[in-house]
Amino acid sequence: TPLGPASSLPQSFLLKCLEQVRKIQGDGAALQEKLVSECATYKLCHPEELVLLGHSLGIPWAPLSSCPSQALQLAGCLSQLHSGLFLYQGLLQALEGISPELGPTLDTLQLDVADFATTIWQQMEELGMAPALQPTQGAMPAFASAFQRRAGGVLVASHLQSFLEVSYRVLRHLAQP
């Protein structure tokens, strides 16, 4: 059912989410920056090639179709946010060992995403919307080479930022009095 006023979501939860999204965005931007600086070396910058590579590597997108501000379905939207964060935890895990320079940034990003997923889960539990079972991890892309892992890193970081932009817009809309 579409959400009327967002009265069922506490302001403290929404503000916490906005803060966490911005932390992930900041740390994700740091990762992207480092990846882009490797772009020239590894020829990773061409958008068309990246899209094709994304298809061939099977890097999935996380949908937020239940979250449009005009007809937002609260249970569905929170569930999609949580599932999306769960997906990105797996994708970031698949990037492990991408490069020693990127390791610390990737590690921090992974924990940030886990924190945000925890926040969403807590709220779903409080609203009685938490599923009985946690989502299970689908097949993650297997990166066969250092090049694929780096290219995968560019794509995952880019997908994650797009997901966060939509999340941020939804949460900001809900946080408006």
Epitope: K16, K23, G26, F86, Q89, Q110, F116, T119, Q122
Partner: antibody, heavy 118, light 112 residues
Framework: QVQLQQSGAELARPGASVKMSCKAS????????MHWVKQRPGQDLEWIGY????????NYNQKFKDKATLTADKSSSTAYMQLSSLTSEDSAVYFC???????????WGQGTTLTVSS | DIVMTQAAFSNPVTLGTSASISCRSN???????????LYWYLQKPGQSPQLLIY???NLASGVPDRFSSSGSGTDFTLRISRVEAEDVGVYYC?????????FGAGTKLELK
Amino acid sequence: QVQLQQSGAELARPGASVKMSCKASGYTFTPYTMHWVKQRPGQDLEWIGYINPSINYTNYNQKFKDKATLTADKSSSTAYMQLSSLTSEDSAVYFCARRGSYGNFDYWGQGTTLTVSS
Amino acid sequence: DIVMTQAAFSNPVTLGTSASISCRSNKSLLHSNGITYLYWYLQKPGQSPQLLIYQMSNLASGVPDRFSSSGSGTDFTLRISRVEAEDVGVYYCAQNLELPLTFGAGTKLELK
């Protein structure tokens, strides 16, 4: 209420391995990361690493990478830490701690005391 | 790694008076999202640590409002307005800006 119950004190020989446990109750285990912290007698707290039980992801402080192995059993809501190649430097109290969504450790186990002695 | 620095002991305090404990980090803990990722924990004798303050200035649930915390990106102060006997223990600051998570060496609050 949330509780983290840690296994009892351990006495081990140098070179041996030990595996300690942290049983979580009073909350859904998988959505929360579980962290481990070391405290040597009269000394500060050192973060060892954490496990994310939902995806079985582990991350370690570089200092403990070759020392600690973190695992979790979702069916029993229990986190484990194995310490290998023990030396007297590993004698300490080890705490498990649940990470809350503000990035803080909101619940702590009572600690497991490890004594390494020949 | 971010290094958190604390004095080992506070100035001995009298019950009912105020106390201050300081902490310094070698890197700013202020993130671009406006949050300062600094935390305070208290470890009472023979107990596990307990959370007092999160994100520099927020009081954890159940913590009396005698406790407060402030600071810049790198210099932080925990204040106890009216010290009680139960406040005795070791106070640790910690950072959660980036991995590895790090703690200060702890400051022992002592009574006169």
